[in-house]
Each structure stands twice: as structure tokens, then as C-alpha cells.
């Protein structure tokens, strides 16, 4: 039975040219996390974090995606095109697969604040 819950940073905003941390957290389960996949709005791969093999960053993003902190991902040099949904997929044993969603809005405005709070999607 899948008892866990994915908590995410929810809806966040950040400045164009700046950076943002995408973070998911799996709670309420003792399941072992074997792999976390990070995907973009069109379901294209951003990165994989395998518990035994380490990180795989999609080559086209390698210059502006930094692994971590933890199982999260740091997006750098943000552009307006980065606005959209991001998904974390947790493969776990023995529970199976959990999925979380984050919405990132990249703002032109210099007053854009990086508002991030953990929430259950």
C-alpha cells in the first residue's frame, strides 16, 4: 500500500536571469527512494538522480541545471520559456512511484520575489 505523500515547493516565482530551487520531499513512508526523475512542462527530461549511480543531467541543460540540494534541482539563468510545470517522479521500493508537481513563473519584473513554500499538491 502506498502511504507516502509528496510535498513540493508548490507555485513559485523567480526573476528572469536568476535561479530557483525545485524541491520535492517524500514523507509518511519508510520506502527507499531508488530514483528521482525531474521533467519539464512538456514531459521532457531535465535530470535523473539515481541512488546508486548518481546524477544524470540532460545534456542540453548541463550548463544551467545544477544537481541538488539533496534530491532537488537548481535551475539557473532563467528565461521566460522556463515558465510552466515541473514534475518530480519518485521511484521507491517497495511502494512504487510517487509524483509531485511544481509550477514556476519566471517574471520580467525586478521586484519578482522567489516565493517558495512546501505544500501538498
Amino acid at each position: 500500500m502506498m502511504t507516502g505523500t509528496i510535498e513540493t515547493t508548490g507555485n513559485i516565482s523567480a526573476k528572469k536571469g536568476g535561479s530557483v530551487i525545485l524541491q520535492c520531499h517524500l514523507s509518511s513512508t519508510m520506502a527507499q527512494v531508488t530514483q528521482v526523475n525531474w521533467e519539464q512542462h512538456d514531459h521532457s527530461l531535465l535530470a535523473i538522480r539515481n541512488a546508486e549511480l548518481g546524477w544524470h543531467i540532460y545534456p542540453a541543460f548541463k550548463d544551467r541545471v545544477a544537481p541538488g540540494p539533496g534530491l532537488g534541482l537548481t535551475l539557473q539563468s532563467l528565461t521566460m520559456n522556463d515558465t510552466g510545470e515541473y514534475f518530480c517522479t519518485y521511484h521507491t521500493y517497495p511502494d512504487g512511484t510517487y509524483r509531485g508537481r511544481i509550477f514556476l513563473e519566471v517574471l520580467e519584473s525586478s521586484v519578482a520575489e522567489h516565493s517558495a513554500r512546501f505544500q501538498i499538491p
Epitope: L45, N50, E52, L53, G54, W55, K62
Partner: antibody, heavy 119, light 107 residues
Framework: EVQLVQSGAEVKKPGASVKVSCKAS????????MHWVRQAPGQGLEWMGR????????KYNEKFKSRVTITVDKLSSTAYMELSSLRSEDTAVYYC????????????WGQGTTVTVSS | DIVMTQSPDSLAVSLGERATINCRVS??????LAWYQQKPGQSPKLLVY???TLAEGVPDRFSGSGSGTDFTLTISSLQAEDVAVYYC?????????FGPGTKVDIK
């Protein structure tokens, strides 16, 4: 065109070390992880480890961990695999292979380097 | 370690006929499976990754299917140039492991 060109065949004595090189061209070297895989004569494929050419961070197959070292030279876009304390069972063709776009598989392979361990 | 087994060890198929190779994995690897083709004296060549995605430049007579622990590579209409050994490999944990290979010949 992606190319991985490996160094030539080696003959080594038991107990010695060998260092195989793999020169990459046709793509941005630091954007793709590199794997090393070996194949003993008439046998299957055996994964040895992988390296991130950008950071130099590597992961190894536990079987080889104490004997293998994978390194890179970013300036020359070259990956290296050094295997120490050689024994006859290490006689094999050694391949470098570029990691694919979408995970830990390999999309391009070098031509292979034959390493013979014999007294 | 994740153990990969392939069946059959070898098969001979008539030109233009279908060839099917199976790969069984000792634990759930979701869809993280690749297939490679190796011709005599050559390096392996990627055919399929993520169980069913065809690699660039691979003819569409090749297809992959399956998830979890059971996977299949199918050659819909065998050509002379398909004579080779075919290996499955999981790409899900350390160590990455390969199946023992399946030799495909012309009948």
C-alpha cells in the same frame, strides 16, 4: 559526427597496470557522461564505471572499485580508464561509451581496445 | 546486483520473418532497459532505450516493449544485415548489467 577513438592494443604482465584512452570529438565533451565497459573473449558485456567529465565525479562497479580509476582531461576531450593489479581474467576488449540523452544507457561506443594479460 | 537473463540463447529465422528476443530482469526496473546489437568484430550499437524508444537512425523494423521485469525486442522482418548478437541492459542501478546475449542467424 560523434566519434570516440581509443588507444591501441596493449600486452601486459600479471600485476601490472594499463591505462586506456578515449578521445571524443563531434560533441561538447563536458555535457555527456562517459562509461567504460569490457568484454572478455567470446563473452558478454561487463560495466566498469562512469564519469562526469564536467565535475570529474565517478561511480564504479563494486567488483572493480579497488582496481579501476576513471579520469578525464577536459582540454583534450579525452577519458581514461586505468586498471591495476592485472590478472589473466582481465584479458578483454575495453570500450568507452558515451552516456545517452535520457539516462544511464550508452548511445555511442568507441572501437574498443584489446588488453592482453599474459606472463 | 540486478540479474538479466535472455531467451533464447540463439535463434535462426528466415529472411523477412519475425524474430523475437526476450529479456527477464530479477527485479522491477520500470522501463529502464536498453537493447544493443553487436556484429562480429564490431562495437555494440544502441537500438532501443527506455524499453521502447528507438535510437536515432535505427530502422523501424526493430521495436521494443515491456516494463517491470519482462521485456521483448522484435525484428519484424529479418534482413541479412541483422545477423548479430543482441544484448539487453538495465539502466537503473549500480552496477549496470547486461544480459548474456542472443545470437540471431539466418535460417
Amino acid at each position: 559526427e560523434v566519434q570516440l577513438v581509443q588507444s591501441g592494443a596493449e600486452v601486459k604482465k600479471p600485476g601490472a597496470s594499463v591505462k586506456v584512452s578515449c578521445k571524443a570529438s563531434g560533441y561538447t565533451f563536458t555535457n555527456y557522461y562517459m562509461h567504460w565497459v569490457r568484454q572478455a573473449p567470446g563473452q558478454g558485456l561487463e560495466w566498469m564505471g562512469r564519469i562526469d567529465p564536467d565535475s570529474g565525479g565517478s561511480k564504479y562497479n563494486e567488483k572493480f572499485k579497488s582496481r579501476v580509476t576513471i579520469t578525464v582531461d577536459k582540454l583534450s576531450s579525452t577519458a581514461y580508464m586505468e586498471l591495476s593489479s592485472l590478472r589473466s581474467e582481465d584479458t578483454a576488449v575495453y570500450y568507452c561509451a558515451r552516456e545517452g540523452h535520457y539516462g544511464f544507457y550508452s548511445d555511442y561506443w568507441g572501437q574498443g581496445t584489446t588488453v592482453t594479460v599474459s606472463s | 546486483d540486478i540479474v538479466m537473463t535472455q531467451s533464447p540463447d540463439s535463434l535462426a529465422v528466415s529472411l523477412g520473418e519475425r524474430a523475437t528476443i526476450n529479456c527477464r530482469v530479477s527485479e522491477n526496473i520500470y522501463s529502464y532497459l536498453a537493447w544493443y546489437q553487436q556484429k562480429p568484430g564490431q562495437s555494440p550499437k544502441l537500438l532501443v532505450y527506455n524499453a521502447k524508444t528507438l535510437a536515432e537512425g535505427v530502422p523501424d523494423r526493430f521495436s521494443g516493449s515491456g516494463s517491470g521485469t519482462d521485456f521483448t525486442l522484435t525484428i519484424s522482418s529479418l534482413q541479412a544485415e541483422d545477423v548479430a548478437v543482441y544484448y539487453c541492459q538495465h539502466h537503473y542501478g549500480n552496477p549496470l548489467t547486461f544480459g548474456p546475449g542472443t545470437k540471431v542467424d539466418i535460417k
